[in-house]
Amino acid sequence: AVNGTSRFTCFYNSRANISCVWSQDGALQDTSCQVHAWPDRRRWNQTCELLPVSQASWACNLILGTPDSQKLTAVDIVTLRVMCREGVRWRMMAIQDFKPFENLRLMAPISLQVVHVETHRCNISWKISQASHYFERHLEFEARTLSPGHTWEEAPLMTLKQKQEWICLETLTPDTQYEFQVRVKPLQGEFTTWSPWSQPLAFRTKPAALGKD
């Protein structure tokens, strides 16, 4: 029997990608392993090669189609299997019935830009990437601003409880360099999690006019 603590976690980006991480204590680093995807009601199946990401974990992306194609729906179930080569044969190490819309993690928001900046305020917009039209407006966002002398972990989270792809940051300090990040999450799905944070957007507030506070 398989020994050691195992974990097989996958997320669907809501369009055409399932990303998986397989970890097992005591597994051999040079073992060749794959993830196989078998949908219950579709004619395609897909495989990806698991590549090491740390001492005891491997990851891969199942590319189901072109980035914006809608390959799965809420009624689909995809049986995902981790298969590892043992000599001349393949051995199944893990299996799960994956419900894509219960396990969502969207791509990080993109195209962050400063719409307008003042001494104390900055208006920023962004776009969501490869998100299913099924969500309509059922998305939420979290944002954070990095102030000088602080870390991202210390930055307070701002929550936008609706599909709002802009924010107006207030009470900023004049002539100061900031960075901004945002992430997105669908409201749907028992095991759904936040997207990765966007690439940071750097901006600088305008200096205060001379003779004014």
């Epitope: 049986t79 299996i95 799960q96």
Partner: nanobody
């Protein structure tokens, strides 16, 4: 070689209950994903419930959710399927199955490595 022996089947009236048992020998229960799979006459095998090894997460087919409960007793190396509010459409041979892997599947019951011989459950008035 792992061996699975089911018991507890029988004839029960609609709305009644049964508890199926699956005794495992030749291996440790905690080393396997365990499932209950049923097959009605003239139909394909259907995953009913399963339990993932190591994290003991449980899964149920929509048709039995809220009525059936899978559990295990590691000391006795036995898995149970408590079936309540039974319906005529639950009539089938119920098989216990084990997979030498992390996790389990209801959708693809053919992925199990070891099978019991089955126990008949008949729901009829």
């Amino acid at each position: 070689q792992v061996q699975l022996v089911e018991s507890g089947g029988g004839l029960v009236q609609p709305g009644g209950s049964l508890r199926l048992s699956c005794a495992i020998s030749g291996g440790t229960l905690d080393s396997y994903g365990i499932g209950w799979v049923r097959q009605a006459p003239g139909k394909q095998r259907e995953g009913v419930s399963c339990m993932s090894r190591s994290d003991d997460r449980t899964y149920y087919a929509d048709s039995v959710k809220g009525r059936f409960t899978i559990s295990k007793d590691s000391a006795k190396n036995t898995v149970y399927l408590q079936m309540t509010s039974l319906k005529p459409e639950d009539t089938a041979v119920y098989y216990c199955a084990a997979v030498d892997a992390y996790g389990c599947s209801l959708v693809q019951p053919t992925t199990y490595d070891f099978w019991g011989l089955g126990t008949q459950v008949t729901v009829s008035s």
